[in-house]
Every structure is written in structure tokens, then in C-alpha cells.
């Protein structure tokens, strides 16, 4: 017991941490002072009635990844204040409703990864009226969802069910919950997907399907009497799909009248872009979908892709598209022209070069586009990039950060409405008249700049941290500046006069520089009370670099001797 006790440390607020130790039981002597108890990753196998008896003020109990196989009936009887209970990844093969009955304050319950076959003989959660987040199920033994399982639950913020190996679903089991903001469903096979879908369509706002093989999925008409679907967002995560089954999935999505957002994360498309509908299939209506997000899409036969034209007509109403880290090197001109409502396009972490971007941003492409993100692609010439985007008349925001431009020409052409340009982490070592005068926000942080002497009359925000600047920029060149972030440069000092010359400046972040703590600098920074309002990272990030005897100390704390300040 004494070694058990030694593995636990508690602070004055009653936050007790004893994770990743060698505890084989809950430490003794726990009192009402304990508010939070984390005993995750230990070797606890048994919880007795007396272990937590005195913990009447306990609000969070984390017991994940132990070897718990037994919990005595009244183990949690005194935990009326408990809000967060995590029993995930233990060896609980039978769940008892008596554990949860006293937990009237519980808002979070995680029972994932325990080897139970069902959620018990009686309704486990019917007394948990405040429950907001519930996680249940496991990867292999949880095979059956019963009608009584979720009885008594009316509203949940999040419900996660690991039904990876589900073999039986009793109709209406999930219908009893009136509203679920976010349902996460792990299912290896799709056999029971439609039955579950029918039950949740009118109660779930955001439906997420994980780890499912949809290669052979076939949609058959739903036996649902009602069509008033609540689902606004459908996410497919780590799902396998083919050309044919994608078409079937779209038929399923057709049933969701109010669907606004569609997301595919870490999915695999085993296809070649053959999305042609068979003759007897009616045309798919994309409904109201406004946002399409695709991240890390894996297409094993990517270079066999040949025809996306059947999907073009489905895209005309989409307003926001993200296709990130999916090896995109070209968006067909015709597709761009069909994206008539598109306002936001994020193609981060792809393979775009200027010459192929030209094909994508062809005449009449993306006519409504306001924001284009091409972060971390294969762009190499600012001049070519700007020129290529001239066709986009409504473009105001461009993020081309994390491309290697190195140099910047003296002049460039850009869409005339440009307001925001992100050139951070592009290896540039100077800024020139290539930067458009219309900008209101410019980000050139994390580059090799040692000078900033551009006149940008409309600029309101300048982000220029992590460069090699030795002084603040000349304020007369930036008459409208509100925000200047210039931390982690090589600035040694700045004066009251310099700051005052930025007439409109509201926010300055200049920490992480090599300040020479002269008497003038210290008196200015320490006497100006108003400075703390402007310097958002003051005082923590303002350290003296010299004189050597005060190096590393906060500027606000440094006091130089009279003799140091009055040398003639």
C-alpha cells in the first residue's frame, strides 16, 4: 500500500495524478479533498466498495488501460459529484447498471475497448440525465445492439459506438435518443448500416462512419416512413470505397434532405474515376451540400483516373471545397468552370505547379472564388503564380505559404481585389513591389528577411515574425497598420518615438528578440503603463540579451545601477 501511495501526487486543488505507474489497486487514504483522480495505465484489476467511499467531491475519475475485470456493485455509490468517468480499455466483460445509478452528475462516460458482448441486461444509462458524451463498444466482442441499450437518454452531444464487428441490430435501438449532435460509428462491414441509418437520420446532426469497407455497398430503398432528416454533416473516416459504391453512397446521401457538409478523411478509393451511372439509375441530386472536405484520400490507381465529367453537374452549388494532402496535381478546367458557387478552395499539401494551375484557373473558372489556399504545393515562381490567378476576378485571399519561392521579382500581377496574402515559410529573402498595394493583411513570417521597406498604404496587419529584421519597419510606409507581429527577429531595441509613429497600432508582438537593455530602453518600457495593452506578449517574452549580467532576465524586472546609467 505504501508504494501505491507513493505513486500518486496531488496538488492543492485536489488534482491527483498517478498514471503510468505500477499501481495494482486504488491507493488507500483518498479523501473528500480529491477532485480529480487519474490512475490510467496501471495494473489495477479490482475496484472495491471502499476504495472511493470518501471521495464525495470527486469530479473526474480516469481508469483507462488498467486490467480492471471486477467492480463491486457499490464502488461508485458516493460519487454523486462525478462528472467524468473513463473506464476504457479494461477487462470488463459484464456491465452493471448499479455502477452508474448513483452518478447523477455524470456528463462523460467512456466504456470503449472492454470485452463485453452487449450493454447488459438492463438499461445502463437511464439514470444519467446529464450525460453529454458517451463512448461504448469494442473492436471484436461487441456484436449486438439492443433496443433497451440507450433507453432514458434524450440528448447527447457525442455518442461513439465501436460496433466494428456488429452482427445484430435491434430496430429502433438508436431511435430512442431524441437528439445526438455527433454520432461516431465504427463498423467494419456495411451489412447493418442501412438499418442504423434509418433510425438515426431524424435525430443525429453530424454522422461519422469509421473504418468501414464500402467496396461492395449497395443502396436499397429505405423503409422509412419519414424523410425529415436532421443530419447536416456526414463524415467518412478511414472508409474504403469503389467507383460503383461511391455512386451507391451518393444515393444514400440523397435521402438526407438537409445535408450541408460532406467529409472524407483518410479514405481509399479503389477506382479509376468511372462514375458513370447505369441506365436505370436516376441522376443524383447533390441537394444543399455546400461544403466538401477531402483529406488524405488514397487512390491506388490514381494515374489511371480518366473521367470525372459525370460528377461535374453535382458541384454547381458547392461553396467550400477542401482537398488536402491527396496528391492533386491538376483540377480540370471544365470542373473549375462548373464550380460556379465556389467561394473557398483549399488545396493544401498537394502537387500543384504554376503551369498546371493555369489549366485549372482557366477562363471562367471558379467565378465566385474569394479564398484560394495552395499551402505547401510545388509552386516556385511568384510571378507565374500571380499571373496564373488573374482569371479569378473575385479572389481576395491567397495563401501560398510553404512553397519554395526563394526570390521575389520587382513586379508581379495579381487579381485586383487582393486583400490577404500569405507568403510565410517560402524561403524569400527580400520583399519587393511584387507585393500588391491593395493588401490589408500580409504574412511573411518564417523567411529570411532582413529588411521591410515596402509602402503598403492599406495594410492593417503585418505578420513578420521569425525573420532577421534588426529594426521595426518604418511606420510612414504602413499608415493604416493595426497589428504588427515581429517576434523572433534580430531587433535589439525600439523607442517610444518609433512606437508613437504607428498612429493606428493596436497590437504589437515583439518578444523573442535580442534586446539590449540600455537605460533608455528600460526606462521607456518600464514607465509606460499603456505599453502592456499594446504588447500582447509582454512581459514573458521580452528578455534582455545584454548587458551580459542581466542576460535572460525579463525586461520589466531588470534594474541597472545608477553608475551604469550615468556614465559620461
Amino acid at each position: 500500500e505504501s508504494s501505491n501511495q507513493a505513486s500518486l501526487s496531488c496538488d492543492r486543488n485536489g488534482i491527483c495524478k498517478g498514471s503510468s505507474g505500477s499501481l495494482n489497486s486504488i491507493p488507500s487514504g483518498l479523501t473528500e479533498a480529491v477532485k480529480s483522480l487519474d490512475l490510467s495505465n496501471n495494473r489495477i484489476t479490482y475496484i472495491s466498495n471502499s476504495d472511493l467511499q470518501r471521495c464525495v467531491n470527486l469530479q473526474a475519475l480516469v481508469l483507462t488501460s488498467n486490467g480492471i475485470n471486477t467492480i463491486e456493485e457499490d464502488s461508485f455509490s458516493s460519487l454523486g459529484s462525478l462528472e467524468h468517468l473513463d473506464l476504457s480499455y479494461n477487462y470488463l466483460s459484464n456491465l452493471s447498471s448499479s455502477w452508474f445509478k448513483p452518478l447523477s452528475s455524470l456528463t462523460f462516460l467512456n466504456l470503449l475497448g472492454n470485452p463485453y458482448k452487449t450493454l447488459g441486461e438492463t438499461s445502463l444509462f437511464s439514470h444519467l440525465t446529464k450525460l453529454q458524451i458517451l463512448r461504448v463498444g469494442n473492436m471484436d466482442t461487441f456484436t449486438k445492439i439492443q433496443r433497451k441499450d440507450f433507453a432514458g437518454l434524450t440528448f447527447l452531444e457525442e455518442l461513439e459506438i465501436d460496433a466494428s464487428d456488429l452482427q445484430s441490430y435491434e430496430p429502433k435501438s438508436l431511435k430512442s435518443i431524441q437528439n445526438v449532435s455527433h454520432l461516431i460509428l465504427h463498423m467494419k462491414q456495411h451489412i447493418l448500416l442501412l438499418e442504423i441509418f434509418v433510425d438515426v437520420t431524424s435525430s443525429v446532426e453530424c454522422l461519422e462512419l469509421r473504418d468501414t469497407d464500402l467496396d461492395t455497398f449497395h443502396f436499397s430503398e429505405l423503409s422509412t416512413g419519414e424523410t425529415n432528416s436532421l443530419i447536416k454533416k456526414f463524415t467518412f473516416r478511414n472508409v474504403k470505397i469503389t467507383d460503383e459504391s461511391l455512386f451507391q453512397v451518393m444515393k444514400l446521401l440523397n435521402q438526407i434532405s438537409g445535408l450541408l457538409e460532406l467529409e472524407f478523411d483518410d479514405c481509399t478509393l479503389n477506382g479509376v474515376g468511372n462514375f458513370r451511372a447505369s441506365d436505370n439509375d436516376r441522376v443524383i441530386d447533390p441537394g444543399k451540400v455546400e461544403t466538401l472536405t477531402i483529406r488524405r484520400l488514397h487512390i491506388p490507381r490514381f494515374y489511371l483516373f480518366y473521367d470525372l465529367s459525370t460528377l461535374y453537374s453535382l458541384t454547381e452549388r458547392v461553396k467550400r471545397i477542401t482537398v488536402e494532402n491527396s496528391k492533386v496535381f491538376l483540377v480540370p478546367c471544365l470542373l473549375s468552370q462548373h464550380l460556379k458557387s465556389l467561394e473557398y478552395l483549399d488545396l493544401s499539401e498537394n502537387l500543384m505547379v504554376e503551369e498546371y494551375l493555369k489549366n485549372s484557373a482557366c477562363e471562367d473558372a471558379w467565378p465566385s472564388l474569394q479564398t484560394l489556399i495552395l499551402r505547401q504545393n510545388h509552386l516556385a515562381s511568384l510571378e507565374k503564380t500571380g499571373e496564373t490567378l488573374l482569371t479569378l476576378k473575385n479572389l481576395t485571399n491567397i495563401d501560398i505559404s510553404k512553397n519554395s519561392f526563394h526570390s521575389m521579382p520587382e513586379t508581379c500581377q495579381w487579381p485586383e481585389k487582393m486583400k490577404y496574402l500569405n507568403l510565410s515559410s517560402t524561403r524569400i529573402h527580400s520583399v519587393t513591389g511584387c507585393i500588391p498595394k491593395t493588401l490589408e493583411i500580409l504574412d511573411v513570417s518564417n523567411n529570411n528577411l532582413n529588411l521591410f521597406s515596402l509602402n503598403l498604404p492599406q495594410l492593417k496587419e503585418l505578420y513578420i515574425s521569425r525573420n532577421k529584421l534588426m529594426t521595426l519597419p518604418d511606420a510612414s510606409l504602413l499608415p493604416m497598420l493595426l497589428v504588427l507581429k515581429i517576434s523572433r527577429n534580430a531587433i535589439t531595441t525600439f523607442s517610444k518615438e518609433q512606437l508613437d509613429s504607428f498612429h493606428t497600432l493596436k497590437t504589437l508582438e515583439a518578444g523573442g528578440n535580442n534586446f539590449i537593455c540600455s537605460c533608455e530602453f528600460l526606462s521607456f518600457t518600464q514607465e509606460q503603463q499603456a505599453l502592456a495593452k499594446v504588447l500582447i506578449d509582454w512581459p514573458a517574452n521580452y528578455l534582455c540579451d545584454s548587458p551580459s549580467h542581466v542576460r535572460g532576465q525579463q525586461v520589466q524586472d531588470v534594474r541597472l545601477s545608477v553608475s551604469e546609467c550615468h556614465r559620461t
Epitope: 494515374y303 491538376l330 499539401e349 502537387l351 500543384m352 503551369e355 510545388h378 510553404k402
Partner: antibody, heavy 118, light 111 residues
Amino acid sequence: QVQLQQSGPELVNPGASVKLSCKASGFTFTTYGINWVKQGPGQGLEWIGWIYPRDGSTNFNENFKDKAALTVDTSSSTAYMELHSLTSEDSAVYFCARLTGGTFLDYWGQGTTVTVSS
Amino acid sequence: DIELTQSPASLAVSLGQRATISCRASESVEYYGTSLMQWYQQKPGQPPKLLIFGASNVESGVPVRFSGSGSGTDFSLNIHPVEEDDIVMYFCQQSRKLPWTFGGGTKLEIK
């Protein structure tokens, strides 16, 4: 500037394996694909396959599927190609090359000569 | 596999004149309006060097005397005027379908 530095020449016995390296500098290694290309003595170029350091995904020419294994070490910005069960047919110069825009090879290593002989 | 046939296998040209090398693909290398065809130059004992990508885009740093044209299955590399330094080997390469393939090469010679 962008550079791909390949390991030195290899003389190996038939049936043995050899591991060639290609160290990248001057660009963000994880943003580009690395391709490998074979050029037999006095012959043309043959594409072996690629690897994307960001996610480790690979794609091979079927002719090399059982011959070559591609790996990367992102911490040292180095790509590797291991050739197995070598025969005299595998004697060639092997190039690594950076894949840009998903379609073209804009920077090449100097090549590693592999000679298979007993 | 897409087969690329380069012609001629060797081409004798006079310095200052135009050289045209052809590359024919066994099937189209078009990808939504872009031809995924590249041209490389290789000097003896050196790796190939990219000249042209996407059929007609000249790689940065490549002299303007090099140009590429063509679409579908028929492509050509033009060098005008030919200089001494250009009398080397040239390869075409497609990246429309895996496996990517190269042409057999064309050797430029002085007439």
C-alpha cells in the same frame, strides 16, 4: 540549392542484396516524391517506382515489384532503394530523382553504379 | 503499358540549324487538357536533365532554343539554333499511366 546526393558504386555477388541511398537537401523532403530510374549499360531509362516521404506510399513498375523495396528516413531526408536477389541483369546505373507536380522529374541524383559479378 | 517510340534513333544536324525529335505514344497521354509528356537531355556520364514538362512548358533555367509541342499521341522537341553543347542524347517520358515509360532515346550528332 536542390541536391540529391547518391551513395557510391557497389560491386556485389549474384544472389546478394544491395541498399542504395539518396540524400536530399535544399528543399522540404516530405513535400515531394522520390523516384528511382534504372539505366542499363548503353541503354535507355526504365522507371522503377516512387515513394512519397510524407506518408510512405509507394508505386512500382510491375517489373520491379519483387526486385526493389523503397523506404525513407525523414529525419535525415534520405531515400533508400534495396535491390534483392541480384543477377547480372541488374548491373546498371540507378538514379534517384525528385518528382514535382506529380508528373515530372526535375532534379536527379548523380547515379549509383551497381555491378553484379562473382 | 504506354509505349513511346522516338524517331529518329539518331539525328545528324548542322550547328545553327533546327533539330526536331519526335515521340509517338501508343495511346493518348492527355489528362484533362494537359499532355503529360516530358523531354530530358542526357550528357555522357551525367543524369538526365529536365527540359520540357507538360509537352510544352520549358523548365526554369533551360535555354529558350528548346521548345516542345504536340498533344494526344504525337509530340516533338525542337532545338533551334542547335549549339555544340546540345549534341547529346534526348529522351521523352510519359506520366499519364503507370508504369511511367521512357522513349528509347534520340542521339543528336553533328552533320
